[in-house]
Interface confidence: low
Amino acid sequence: QPSVSPGEPSPPSIHPGKSDLIVRVGDEIRLLCTDPGFVKWTFEILDETNENKQNEWITEKAEATNTGKYTCTNKHGLSNSIYVFVRDPAKLFLVDRSLYGKEDNDTLVRCPLTDPEVTNYSLKGCQGKPLPKDLRFIPDPKAGIMIKSVKRAYHRLCLHCSVDQEGKSVLSEKFILKVRPAFKAVPVVSVSKASYLLREGEEFTVTCTIKDVSSSVYSTWKRENSQTKLQEKYNSWHHGDFNYERQATLTISSARVNDSGVFMCYANNTFGSANVTTTLEVVDKGFINIFPMINTTVFVNDGENVDLIVEYEAFPKPEHQQWIYMNRTFTDKWEDYPKSENESNIRYVSELHLTRLKGTEGGTYTFLVSNSDVNAAIAFNVYVNTKPEILTYDRLVNGMLQCVAAGFPEPTIDWYFCPGTEQRCSASVLPVDVQTLNSSGPPFGKLVVQSSIDSSAFKHNGTVECKAYNDVGKTSAYFNFAFKGNNKEQIHPHTLFTP
């Protein structure tokens, strides 16, 4: 029994005065606690606790279940204990079959012995299966067998406590180890969509998916810069042993413009936290914004191609798109497609492919698009550059030589005189009159220019050249004439087109 200094309170003394006592099943257990300030006896085994206010504990017919720790406590809170084994060959183990282990921690298989003198107290796998190679354990006859550093791989492991009795192996009831995983990473969080665009009155619903090793992960929806508790609904699943999934769905049944903002799904475990956000934009009505991808005034050479391209934002989705020219709708030559694969995409592209444009195909090309809320349009002014064409070249009754040319941009007409048989006309002749004929008409067609010179100025045989040119090219027409006596005998116009 423990000894203490005189004057200090001392622990109670127990008879029999030993730390362990072995009795046979059916025998009497008689334990005496001696202390002037005796309070109680306490009996503990597994999760069971009994108390006795008598200073003598008597169990007339001991059973295996009376195996355990008997503690006497005095009024000073000092105590003394004796451990009693009730040897029962038919019941070698006391068992609490609940067995939970926290990953990386130790856990106790609670199968204390009723007989400390049996041998080879250990763990064995069920149905003769070997235990995992890395499983380490420490047996303690009074408590059970401690498994060291539980691994996740031990989950659902079936095992028995085992002893050798008279040369034979005796197994306890089976235990199934349930491993509670340790958090070794932050939760994985994802959101159904990164952004939402809604009209007033439409329902906003967004789902956050939280994945972790167990259901003890915490999660919540928060509104950034707000403490308001949001209404959310949960669904959860266990996909296998350490694969837990929770879906937290946030709903605003009738969204308003002032509900716009950033919503955060936050999750944490003992390792750390993670979050993901989604943005809600609520507009009072739908919209369409069109962005031309090329200049809306387009100059293109005769016979060449041009693509008229627009990008546009449309919400809600576009319902009707069309390209129009001269009040006619294109049924082909155009395509319209969403700009991105993103589910939240509101940006689209429309392309009109104009091929081998003629001079007569200049004008206003209009793209129109509508959705259920609004219409929008954009116009492109297309000018087709054409080489001058000489429409007429005549000698008028008043003796004037007249040249009329059409093209775009507006052609310039120059006159040259070639004396005799010379091929090159170099001497320029000033026109008497120059007019642009249809400048008051539509701005996209060819422009027509008329120029005249006085043929009476020419006194010798020769050729007169009318040359029309612009940025695209040039074209010439010629007048041949000869004198017979004092008369101009012949005037033969002919043309020579030069690229």
């Epitope: 576009p318 319209d336 497609y337 969403p338 991105s340 694969e341 993103n342 589910e343 995409n345």
Partner: nanobody, 129 residues
Framework: QVHLVESGGGLVQAGGSLGLSCAAS????????MGWFRQAPGKEREFVAA????????LYADSVKGRFTISRDNGENTVYLQMNSLKPEDTAVYYC??????????????????????WGQGTLVTVSS
């Protein structure tokens, strides 16, 4: 390679109903908008109805609005056309088509033939008066 097979065509009295199915294989069916078109003898192929990847957006030709319903089952890789109150002018070969230029999740549907890259062989629907 995408393979589309229509079924459900046949002869029906005016005012009656018929349901067409189109089974798709060889493509991630759920990513794309699907459409039904029809071609009457001696006429051009015309748009009937279309449905977006999720089924959230639908589009109908004016001539069938309120009578025809397009739907889809992404699990079964099938698109359906339920035709009610049939008229003799609905007589045509009905074609199912997949819009592979559409992109996942946009909800975009188009009535333009040129957007639909893959076509079935067609199923004949005859409505007698």
């Amino acid at each position: 390679q995408v393979h589309l097979v229509e079924s459900g065509g046949g002869l029906v009295q005016a005012g009656g109903s018929l349901g067409l199915s189109c089974a798709a294989s060889g493509h991630t069916f759920s990513n794309y908008a699907m459409g039904w078109f029809r071609q009457a003898p001696g006429k051009e192929r015309e748009f009937v109805a279309a449905i977006s990847w999720s089924g959230g957006s639908t589009l109908y030709a004016d001539s069938v609005k309120g009578r025809f319903t397009i739907s889809r089952d992404n699990g079964e890789n099938t698109v359906y056309l339920q035709m009610n109150s049939l008229k003799p002018e609905d007589t045509a070969v009905y074609y199912c088509a997949l819009d592979s230029t559409g992109v996942y999740g946009t909800g975009y549907v188009s009535s333009r033939k040129g957007r639909y890259e893959y076509w079935g062989q067609g199923t004949l629907v005859t409505v007698s008066s």
